[in-house]
């Protein structure tokens, strides 16, 4: 007798590993024999699809090599024309051993920054990810965390974080290990022991001692008054990432000695500096009201004008001499924007050397004033018209209130380079000689108050005056 189809063994959930075989069984009793069709996620599986094998009159569906994309709901439908079609469904869960799809890589990181070591995984059930540092499991803390993605994040990296790391992905089917990678922690150069200042007698030997550390180990260089040390012997030793440098000097003049520790991080360098003054007892007679100290110029405004690493006098009448003197120059330079192209560089050179005077680092640090001749060259040659206007404005109080703080130098009160060549400072930017001066028309009603000498030429000068310039 005809009999409608009945599925005697309903489909069950099948767990299968990737690349293995998975079979669904759909046993049907009916008469006549039914037609059995299969669907995956409601899409018909074609009989000729070579990834599947359908046997036993359609009652067995075999996936020949499971892929992770095969998971889903599989249904068999039996129909023989008697009664209605019947259906049974079951799920395929593709199980997968852990696999590390994005393994960690070697990392170099600067101390204090954030490091992230990637470890992206696949697997079903979802693998749990842990990390091993050296030979021990890595413990998470407020700085160190394993992210949801499996990556390891280390905030505020410390020296002790350096070492060998690997990630471990684990689920019920197995465990996968990444290759071992290296986290290298680099540390900015830092001075541990700064050289000490000394007040010594002329002709003494002094040893300056500077110790620095960093990863990689820094190199130490010594600077004397802004230039590489030309004399003296340097001894160096390195132990446990600490470099020790000793500079032995024979003292014949005062100076500012700077120890500079430098190390490299990729393309960038980090430096640390410490300075010491060597003064000679009885070297300079203290000048009245010269309260201040010598320091290397490290501002911006006068960079192009002052010698590199120039030793300048910082006046402690100001609460913050560096800032105050820098900003007074800046204010004045804004006033200079309107002056002629002949005057401006000369005035800038005068201004910078007047506010940031060269410094003699004796027992009492002493500012070295500009030589009278250079001041007069600016006043009566380069900036004759402008100087007259400026003096008039100052007398009439037309400048903004801080301009009087600048106190434009009175040339006549400055020492002459003829009296004592070491008692005053030259302006190397004024690169001209007497021959050039003869081509200028008279600037003022009277001759310059002193003979302007042949000023020493300077190859690094930023401008020169030639007969083609006119100041009228």
């Amino acid at each position: 007798l005809p009999k409608a189809p009945v599925i005697t063994t309903p489909l069950e959930t099948v767990d299968a590993l990737v690349e293995e075989v998975a079979t669904f069984m759909c046993a049907v009793e009916s008469y006549p024999q039914p037609e059995i069709s299969w669907t995956r996620n409601k899409i018909l599986i074609k009989l000729f699809d070579t990834r599947y094998s359908i046997r036993e009159n359609g009652q067995l569906l075999t996936i020949l090599s499971v892929e992770d994309s095969d998971d889903g709901i599989y249904c068999c439908t039996a129909n023989n024309g008697v009664g209605g079609a019947v259906e049974s469904c079951g799920a395929l869960q593709v199980k997968m051993k852990p696999k590390i799809t994005r393994p960690p890589i070697n990392v170099k990181i600067i101390e204090g920054l954030k490091a992230v070591l990637p470890c992206t995984t696949m697997g079903n059930p979802k693998p749990s990810v842990s990390w091993i540092k050296g030979d021990s499991p890595l413990r998470e803390n407020s700085r160190i965390a394993v992210l949801e993605s499996g990556s390891l994040r280390i905030h505020n990296v410390q020296k002790e974080d350096a070492g060998q790391y690997r990630c471990v992905a684990k689920n019920s089917l197995g465990t996968a290990y990444s290759k071992v990678v290296k986290l290298e922690v680099e540390v900015f150069a830092r001075i541990l022991r700064a050289p000490e200042s000394h007040n010594v007698t002329f002709g003494s030997f002094v040893t300056l001692h500077c110790t620095a550390t960093g990863i990689p180990v820094p190199t130490i260089t010594w600077i004397e008054n802004g230039n590489a040390v030309s004399s003296g012997s340097i001894q160096e030793s390195v132990k446990d990432r600490v470099i020790d440098s000793r500079l032995q000097l024979f003292i014949t003049k005062p100076g500012l000695y700077t120890c500079i520790a430098t190390n490299k991080h990729g393309e960038k360098f980090s430096t640390a500096k410490a300075a010491a003054t060597i003064s000679i007892a009885e070297w300079s007679k203290p000048q009245k009201d010269n309260k201040g100290y010598c320091a290397q110029y490290r501002g911006e405004v006068c960079n192009a004008v002052l010698a590199k690493d120039a030793l300048v006098f910082l006046n402690t009448s100001y609460a913050d001499p560096e800032e105050a003197q820098e900003l007074l120059v800046h204010t004045a330079w804004n006033e200079l924007k309107v002056v002629s192209p002949v005057c401006r560089p000369a005035a800038e050179a005068l201004l910078c050397n007047h506010i940031f005077q060269e410094c003699s680092p004796g027992v009492v640090p002493t500012p070295i004033p500009i030589c009278r001749e250079y001041c007069l060259a600016v006043k009566e040659l380069f900036c004759a018209k402008e100087w007259l206007v400026m003096e008039e404005k100052t007398h009439r109080g037309l400048y903004r209130s801080e301009m009087h703080l600048l106190s434009v130098p009175e040339c006549s009160k400055l020492p002459s380079m003829h009296w004592d060549p070491t008692a005053c400072a030259r302006l190397p930017h004024l690169d001209y000689n007497k021959e050039n001066l003869k081509t200028f028309p008279p600037m003022t009603s009277s001759k310059p108050s002193v003979d302007i000498p042949n000023l020493p030429s300077s190859s690094s000068s930023s401008f020169s005056v030639s007969p083609t310039y006119s100041m009228t």
């Epitope: 500096k273 320091a295 501002g299 913050d320 105050a324 007074l328 703080l405």
Partner: antibody, heavy 124, light 107 residues
Amino acid sequence: EVQLVESGGGLVQPGGSLRLSCAASGFTFSSSSIHWVRQAPGKGLEWVASISSSYSSTSYADSVKGRFTISADTSKNTAYLQMNSLRAEDTAVYYCARKYYRWRHNKYQGFDYWGQGTLVTVSS
Amino acid sequence: DIQMTQSPSSLSASVGDRVTITCRASQSVSSAVAWYQQKPGKAPKLLIYSASSLYSGVPSRFSGSRSGTDFTLTISSLQPEDFATYYCQQSLWYPVTFGQGTKVEIK
């Protein structure tokens, strides 16, 4: 993150000494000056001393000159205020504050970060 | 020493008011003036530096200005969290000096 943390305050007898510390983190010590500012109970702010760590140049208010010494250990990023011959009028909350050099700004900088303060009480 | 004379020493105002505090320097201090806000039991906070530059993170209702040796802090529309003591400071000349403070209270 920039932080200044003072410590070392407490109760001391007149004529006694205390050493205050100001531990700095999150910035380059050598690009800053460190200042101590105090505030007596119910009063205003009074600047006490400063140090420019790059040059170790120091300055002091007249009221503390000769009694207080400011210093810095750049390797530890810490500034100190050694207070000797303390007087009742030195009783105050002592703050350390930093001033950072920003040359390209061409502006006078203020004290942009302050510590939480440490109380110094001078009393017999 | 440079005197920074701050006025008024205290004021009462309501939320939404425009508040002005002035400071006069006894001699030229260029633009080296900063303004700070201090709440009871807390450290001062920088509001304005270089006379008129707003410090980062400070609301734009605060502004500073300068006219010669007179400096002004203005709060354009007072908010509840602005009730505090305000100090001016000059940092050009040694020693650094502060104004005596202005306490802004709720009316």
